[in-house]
Amino acid sequence: EVEKTACPSGKKAREIDESLIFYKKWELEACVDAALLATQMDRVNAIPFTYEQLDVLKHKLDELYPQGYPESVIQHLGYLFLKMSPEDIRKWNVTSLETLKALLEVNKGHEMSPQVATLIDRFVKGRGQLDKDTLDTLTAFYPGYLCSLSPEELSSVPPSSIWAVRPQDLDTCDPRQLDVLYPKARLAFQNMNGSEYFVKIQSFLGGAPTEDLKALSQQNVSMDLATFMKLRTDAVLPLTVAEVQKLLGPHVEGLKAEERHRPVRDWILRQRQDDLDTLGLGLQGGIPNGYLVLDLSMQEALS
């Protein structure tokens, strides 16, 4: 904290301009009026104040707005945003997407800081849901944003917002998250024709149930192995050899390279060796001929 001293003669700031960068911290404290600063916040970012000087300016704004800054000030914080704590940000009411964009721009290209995470949380909670424009903005700045949300938070994403999601936005999502996102994607893309639908839904298929995979196998989609390997094991296990062959099309040959990895390994163990042999890939580990397969889970369900 800068101690209170009188402003030297002739140094009282009449406007926020570059001459202030040559002021010592105590001079800024003594010579810059908080109300003037608030009305000319848009100039601050164009002036190369040191972070120590920005601390002084922040202190002035804190005194002027102890309950939290108004959005007119927040929108123009620029690099001063980097000096805010999550506690400061929790006092704000940010409703404009333009304000959000302006603040995200300051941290562009860097990891999501606690300040940014708090800002996004405040903004999304204020809106009530993660609408398409917000999601568009957030994933543009932070491609991994969607996968940082819990399944509960993802449940508030309306299906219409799914159109904003790019494949790379889902790279770090785990199965629990995809379980929530897949039904939304299915709903969002339901009116598209077969090949276009598959292109859009492909990134979300890690959340698809068996019946949807069976339906896709009837549509000549030629799923690539990378997508197949991300499918839920429990959704892949009931698929027949014929269904997997149709699902993968020419990519079926890739199963050989993945035969030791899930879900391929577990799927092989569930297939008859005879059926696997029809693929001509040399896949081993299926159920030998003449063995009877009892589905105990089915038996339990019946009793």
Epitope: P48, T50, Y51, Y79, L82
Partner: nanobody
Framework: QVQLVESGGGVVQAGGSLRLSCAAS????????MRWYRQAPGTERDLVAV??????YYADAVKGRFTISRDNSKNTLYLQMNSLRAEDTAVYYC???????????WGQGTLVTVSS
């Protein structure tokens, strides 16, 4: 992290010239502004010049005599000092601050002595 190393200081006659260099290494992509400060014996450290994007700023005491510049390809900051005066004698420090971490970094300083 950003590391800064100054060079180019020395003893020069009044009216002479010197060029200081500051080599930056580390996370130089995140640098926001770069500055030259100076500190004469027994005084506070004073801001001399700043480069911020394509804009430059100078303290009144050096305006018209000193020129700050930056070569991004070499990650080097310069201070060209002409018409040097005895009162320019000081330790000159290079400073940079970064986006993201909102941190200040300093070099170790280089001594400039102007003899009259």
């Amino acid at each position: 992290q950003v590391q800064l190393v100054e060079s180019g200081g020395g003893v020069v006659q009044a009216g002479g010239s010197l060029r200081l260099s500051c080599a930056a290494s580390g996370s130089t992509f995140s640098i926001r502004a770069m500055r030259w400060y100076r500190q004469a014996p027994g005084t506070e450290r004073d801001l001399v010049a700043v480069i911020y994007g394509s804009s430059t700023y100078y303290a009144d005491a050096v305006k018209g005599r000193f020129t700050i510049s930056r070569d991004n390809s070499k990650n080097t900051l310069y201070l060209q000092m002409n018409s040097l005066r005895a009162e320019d004698t000081a330790v000159y420090y290079c400073n940079a601050d970064t986006i993201g971490t909102a941190r200040d970094y300093w070099g170790q300083g280089t001594l400039v002595t102007v003899s009259s």
